[in-house]
């Protein structure tokens, strides 16, 4: 009668550099087992409603589940299992042949540091204090954490921030990303990307707010001094930011090598994997150190750019130095130079 909903259920996420994402392993009576994505009658390529795995994320002190499906970079330990019945049930499982098992991956949101809610209600006699000014980033439906339209709330008033492209506001953007516990400012988002256009069927809390703000002091050091209230404008841009703490990050894998610690670099765009094309702006080992770390391998031994004599070779391109800075990947439809990376193998 064991399921991941049970209070004493134990799980962990491995093969990534974060406890909040990776290959799902569960603890059953005889030890830790990797869960095959073919479990519960699913196909190995099937993606699931991730919120079903909330309990796993919650017990790992992570945020909401973002994706549940094939992990794709399958590392098979001693024991892998296929389970039957309802998704999330582990009462009927059998050992799987390792070469038949595609591992199940789960990505939970990396949580911002917040204090846990207290369980005792406040005394009814104390008046409710005025809420301090706060910010919120409203992502597009299914969009990224730490990316979106900025909303500012002061007391009971809240709304977007009017923004002109000529505003010199780099200091302010860094301050806002930092205040949101999202790291530093990377870039402004066009409104289509940030999710300005609202679906009429969207829940009430994501409908346009009645208040609008204008930047008052771009060198402010406390929120109450940054903005002033203005009459809402029908046209004009609103402030939409991408901060360095955005999630989910680009996932990478190494394919075609003799172990999971070497191979041609591939990255994921949605559910598809494609070769990562060489970028002359990122020819340092920093990018490959990050890739090696994601595979849970040691540091980079070597990397070499494979010749792209083929005009039809396609792939994905990231213009930044590190993949972790890549908010979006660009398609390259010809002359994609692949990169073969060898990392130190911790388990030779």
């Amino acid at each position: 009668r064991l399921s991941w909903y049970d209070p004493d259920f134990q799980a962990r996420l491995t093969r990534s550099n974060s406890k909040c994402q990776g290959q799902l392993e569960v603890y059953l009576k005889d030890g830790w087992h990797m869960v095959c994505s073919q479990s519960w009658g699913r196909s190995s390529k099937q993606w699931e409603d991730p919120s079903q795995a909330s309990k796993v994320c919650q017990r790992l002190n992570c945020g909401v589940p973002l994706s549940l499906g094939p992990f794709l970079v399958t590392y098979t330990p001693q024991s892998s299992i296929i389970c039957y019945g309802q998704l999330g049930s582990f009462s009927n499982c059998s050992h799987s042949r390792n070469d038949m098992c595609h591992s199940l991956g789960l990505t939970c949101l990396e949580p911002q540091k917040t204090t846990p809610p207290t369980t005792r209600p406040p005394p009814t006699t104390t008046p409710e204090p005025t809420a301090p000014p706060r910010l919120q980033l409203v992502a597009q439906s299914g969009g990224q954490h730490c990316a979106g339209v900025v909303e500012f709330y002061s007391g009971s008033l809240g709304g977007t921030i009017s923004y002109e492209a000529q505003d010199k506001t780099q200091d302010l953007e860094n301050f806002l990303c930092n205040n949101l516990q999202c790291g530093s400012f990377l870039k402004h988002l066009p409104e289509t990307e940030a999710g300005r256009a609202q679906d009429p069927g969207e829940p009430r809390e994501h409908q346009p707010l009645p208040i609008q703000w204008k930047i008052q002091n771009s060198s402010c050091t406390s929120l109450e001094h940054c903005f002033r209230k203005i009459k809402p404008q029908k046209s004009g841009r609103v402030l939409a930011l991408l901060c360095s703490g955005f999630q989910p990050k680009v996932q990478s894998r190494l394919v075609g090598g003799s172990s999971i610690c070497e191979g041609t670099v591939e990255v994921r765009q949605g559910a598809q994997w494609a070769a990562l094309c060489d970028s002359s702006s990122a020819r340092s080992s920093l990018r490959w150190e990050e890739v090696c770390r994601e595979q849970q391998c040691g540091s980079v031994n070597s990397y070499r750019v494979l010749d792209a004599g083929d005009p039809t070779s396609r792939g994905l391109f990231c213009p930044h130095q590190k993949l972790s800075q890549c908010h979006e990947l660009w398609e390259r439809n010809s002359y994609c130079k692949k990169v073969f990376v060898t990392c130190q193998d911790p388990n030779p």
């Epitope: 909903y5 699931e48 409603d49 991730p50 919120s51 079903q52 909330s54 309990k55 994320c57 919650q58 002190n61 992570c62 945020g63 909401v64 589940p65 998704l87 939970c108 949101l109 949580p111 911002q112 917040t114 846990p116 809610p117 369980t119 919120q136 980033l137 954490h145 730490c146 516990q181």
Partner: nanobody, 121 residues
């Protein structure tokens, strides 16, 4: 503070029906999974039924086909329709929810105080 308050328990004869409700209130940004658990005297707490925010459901084998879990996301309320009740369904039924207090907060868990369901033969 997030509070879960269950209602709808009571004494019913075998074969009868009950509908449990659980209302969540407090500093909730969003609720992920919500579920019903039960604990009979001298036994461990067990999962009865769970529903995800996407509407996917999970039922314990012992209640499949008899119990139906549902939720009203707008009201932050969870329901459990229990039909064809059996004496072995007698237990204290607890509501449980995983929730965010703000966008990007860790997921926290909250439990209700429980509501007694007694099925007489």
């Amino acid at each position: 503070q997030v509070q879960l308050v269950e209602s709808g328990g009571g004494l019913v004869q075998a074969g009868g029906s009950l509908r449990l409700s659980c209302a969540a209130s407090g500093s909730i940004f969003s609720i992920s999974v919500m579920g019903w658990y039960r604990q009979a005297p001298g036994k461990e707490r067990e999962t009865v039924a769970v529903i995800s925010s996407g509407g996917s459901t999970y039922y314990a084998d012992s209640v499949k086909g008899r119990f139906t879990i549902s939720r009203d996301n707008a009201k932050n309320t969870l329901y459990l329709q229990m039909n064809s009740l059996k004496p072995e369904d007698t237990a204290v039924y607890y509501c449980n929810a995983d929730f965010e207090t703000a966008s990007g907060s860790p997921l926290y868990e909250s439990w209700g105080q429980g509501t007694q369901v007694t099925v007489s033969s």
